[in-house]
Every structure is written in C-alpha cells, then in structure tokens.
C-alpha cells in the first residue's frame, strides 16, 4: 500500500509540476517592468519567452511575437530549449508512469517491468524538473545582470540635457511558477524512484523453507529477514511470497506474480 501511495503521489506531484512547467513556458510574464516606488504606471511592459507585451493605462494590451530566430539572444534560446526539453521529458515520463502505476492492470506485466518503468519515469521527471529549474535560473540570472547594467546607466542623454529613462525589468510571475513547478516535478521524480525500490523484486528471492520447531511452526527465509515477512503471518507451512516489501494490507490469500492490487 505504501508503495502504491508513494508511486501515485509521485505521479500526481509530477503531473502538477509538468503542468506548471508548460504554464510557465507559455506565460508572458517572465520579466516585468520594474515600477520602482510607483505602483501605477501609464505603460507597463512585460516579456515572455515567445513574445513581449505592453499594457496601457487604458487597459489596452498589445503583444508582439519574436518573429526572428537568429536575432534573439543566445541565452533566451537556451532557456527556450531547456524548457522544451523539460516539457518533452516530462510528457514522456508521464506516459511511461501511467503504465507503471501499480493500481493499473495491463495484461500480464510483471512487477519487475513496472519497477523499471517507474524508475525510468522517475529519472525523466528528475531531469525534467532540473531542466525547468535551470532554464528559469538562467533567465533570472540574465535579468539580474541586465537590471544592474540598466541601473548603472539609468539616465542617458546628450550632455545631460535630454533624459531617456531606460526600462528596467525584474522577475515576472512565470519565474516563480517555473521554480515551483520544476521543484514539484523533481520531488515527484524522487518519489517515483523511491516507489521503484519497493516494487522491484529482490535478486536473492529464494523459495522459503519451513523448519518445524517443537511447539510451534516458524518459517525461516534465507537472504535476510524482512519486516512482516515470514514471521507470525505464515505458520501453516505455506510457501512465503515476497515480491518486494509489501505491507500487510497488500497480502493476498493466493499470491502469484500476476496478481495486482
């Protein structure tokens, strides 16, 4: 039950995380105009990975796509690539993890196969989360650098006669969405990897042998003792089945490798 819960929770957390990564990638507010001490502005600029927007005090909002590929900064291209890689890996991970879920019965798929799929999806989620966090962090670093550069030459002009206020940009909502989403995907991936350990059958999984001691029967199992396996629960000379660390509510009356909860 704990394995199923861990796997299921990992899947849900990753799903939320990947949805967040997609949302962040599509959002226009990666960088927003720094308003200094003035919360009300007549023209408010904000930019995303794919387009830049301007919102006026009239409520009119105009967005323009970046219709050039070569003219864009390399860093922006790198961030785009990281986010897309994160989404693609996350989407594949989700697809794999759906089939790996313990609660879903697919033909005669073995636990070992499910364990491998769970591990694969977990790794994919971890890499996906790392890609998103890296992408957002690169963009944030770019913003910080540009912010201080534009602060240094905030006002420029001919002999100080004409002032040109340079627009400074600060962190937009998409960055925070991206960080949180990347973190969630990463956590979900770790949970999937933990669940995989519980799903995988041990290599040294011998058939248990019953030794009859005087007074009462106790089953001994070579290869080390496992909690709630072989003790107390099996005193009627039945073959002990251990398909990984199972909790009590997963114990079935006639265990077989084809049984799924």
């Amino acid at each position: 039950m704990a394995v199923t819960a861990c796997q299921g929770l990992g899947f849900v957390v990753s799903l939320i995380g990947i949805a967040g990564i997609i949302a962040a990638t599509c959002m226009d507010q990666w960088s927003t105009q720094d308003l200094y001490n003035n919360p009300v502005t007549a023209v408010f600029n904000y930019q995303g990975l794919w387009r830049s927007c301007v919102r006026e005090s009239s409520g009119f909002t105009e967005c323009r796509g970046y219709f050039t590929l070569l003219g864009l900064p390399a860093m922006l291209q790198a961030v785009r690539a990281l986010m897309i890689v994160g989404i693609v890996l996350g989407a594949i991970g989700l697809l794999v993890s759906i089939f790996a879920l313990k609660c879903i019965r697919i033909g005669s798929m073995e636990d070992s196969a499910k364990a491998n799929m769970t591990l694969t999806s977990g790794i994919m989620f971890i890499v996906s989360g790392l890609c998103a966090i890296a992408g957002v962090s690169v963009f944030a670093n770019m913003l910080v650098t540009n912010f201080w550069m534009s602060t240094a030459n905030m006002y420029t002009g001919m002999g100080g006669m004409v002032q040109t206020v340079q627009t400074r940009y600060t962190f937009g909502a998409a960055l925070f969405v991206g960080w949180v989403a990347g973190g969630l995907t990463l956590i979900g991936g770790v949970m999937m990897c933990i669940a995989c350990r519980g799903l995988a059958p041990e290599e040294t999984n011998y058939k248990a042998v019953s030794y009859h001691a005087s007074g009462h029967s106790v089953a001994y199992k070579p290869g080390g003792f496992k909690a709630s396996t072989g003790f107390g629960s099996n005193t009627k000379n039945k073959k002990i089945y251990d398909g990984g660390a199972r909790t009590e509510d997963e114990v079935q009356s006639y265990p077989s490798k084809h049984d799924y909860v």
């Epitope: 007549a42 023209v43 600029n45 930019q47 006026e56 323009r64």
Partner: antibody, heavy 115, light 113 residues
Framework: EVQLVESGGGLVQPGGSLRLSCAVS?????MNWVRQAPGKGLEWVAW????????TYADDFKGRFTISRDDSKNTLYLQMNSLRAEDTAVYYC???????????WGQGTLVTVSS | DIQMTQSPSSLSASVGDRVTITCKSS????????????LTWYQQKPGKAPKLLIY???TLESGVPSRFSGSGSGTDYTLTISSLQPEDFATYYC?????????FGQGTKVEIK
C-alpha cells in the same frame, strides 16, 4: 458609443469643497479629470482605474483632490477640498483610450472659486 | 515629471497653407517594449472640449481628416496640416501619454491670417 456628462460645478468660496460627478455610459476601463483655467491650457488632474479604483494624481492635486468611482451608478467623481482661486476652471472628465489618449470627453463643468 | 514644450505658441496662416507645429519633451516618450512613441495631439475650438487627432505620435484617430499627420520619435515631435481648412483654425495641444502625470504642452493657436 461612450457618453460622458459632468455635473456639480458652481460657485464656491476659497477653502470650500465641491464634488464633481461624471455620468459614464459605454465601456470605460479608466478615466481622467482634466481642467482648463479661463484662457489657459489643459492641465491633467487625476486618473482612475474604473475596475480596481486605483488612482493617481498630478503633484499639485495630491492631498486636496480625490478621484473615485461608483460601480453601481457608473459614475466618476472628483472631490475637491481646500479650494483656491486658482482652481477656477472648466473641469472635464475624459475616457482613457488606446495609446493612453483621452478619446472621449464630457462637455465640461465650470467651477468658480471666489469670495 | 515630463515637461512638454510646444512651438510656436501661435501662428497665422491662410486656407490651403501647410502648417507645422512642433512639440519637445524633456524625456523620451519612446517605449522600448513596443517601439511606440506615446505622444498625443488634440485640437480644441473655443468653448468646446478637446478632440483627439493623433496618438502614438503618428496614428490618425478614426474620423480625423488625412490632411493631419504626425511624426517624430524620442523627444521631438511634429504635427503637420498639409492643407489648412477653415475648420482647422483652433488651438492644438500635444500630450505626454508615456508616464504619469500626463502633461500637456502649453498649446499652439492657429489663427487666420
């Protein structure tokens, strides 16, 4: 079609108060008050977001003038306190249009501050 | 605050003349986000409310005759009336629409010669 009708102007003594109203019909995201002293140019007074009620003022009017709106009545207000002789002007309400323009204007209401 | 300076303060012209009014701002009105200059031109006739002519420095408001045109970028802007008509005799104002507080030029009065 947007229509703006101002009211509430009149004669007031120095130090007195007055509240101007602007009845708004049609879509307005944000509104302005602009004034024009006799024989002088246009002077922007204040702006308000009609949805959030967020205001901003010209420095000369901060503290004395308050811009507000009543959603239910679809009305814009300008509360003017501590009025001075130099506040004598025609007050216009104007809608903020694309490009932060003032694309629709009311007919104006005259405020005279005199003892 | 952005100061707006119009010149000339008044001018005399005849019907059919080409008229040019200039407006200078103390700060650039060009917005880097959309590369648009937030300068607006208005026309006002005596006893009437102002009328919007041009926004974004060069975009003509719908219903405004094509003889009116605007140009400029940064801090220097121009309103041109290609062929002055009798109904064009009025006062013209430029306005900073880039940042609060919105500010107007002192106006240019176009009179009949």
């Amino acid at each position: 079609e947007v229509q703006l009708v101002e009211s509430g102007g009149g004669l007031v003594q120095p130090g007195g108060s007055l509240r101007l109203s602007c009845a708004v019909s049609g879509y307005t995201f944000s509104m302005n008050w602009v004034r024009q002293a006799p024989g002088k140019g246009l002077e922007w007074v204040a702006w308000i977001n009609m949805y959030t009620g967020e205001p901003t003022y010209a420095d000369d009017f901060k503290g004395r003038f308050t811009i507000s709106r009543d959603d239910s009545k679809n009305t814009l207000y300008l509360q003017m306190n501590s009025l001075r002789a130099e506040d004598t002007a025609v007050y216009y309400c104007a809608r903020t249009g694309t490009g932060n323009t003032m694309d629709y204007w009311g007919q104006g209401t005259l405020v005279t501050v005199s003892s | 605050d952005i100061q707006m300076t119009q010149s000339p303060s008044s001018l005399s012209a005849s019907v059919g003349d080409r008229v040019t009014i200039t407006c200078k701002s103390s700060q650039s009105l060009l917005n880097s986000g959309n590369q648009k200059s937030y300068l607006t031109w208005y026309q006002q006739k005596p006893g009437k409310a102002p009328k919007l002519l041009i926004y974004w420095a060069s975009t003509l408001e719908s219903g405004v005759p094509s003889r009116f045109s605007g140009s400029g970028s940064g801090t220097d802007y121009t309103l041109t009336i290609s062929s002055l008509q009798p109904e064009d005799f009025a006062t013209y104002y430029c306005q900073n629409a880039y940042s609060f507080p919105f500010t107007f030029g002192q106006g240019t009065k176009v009179e009949i010669k």
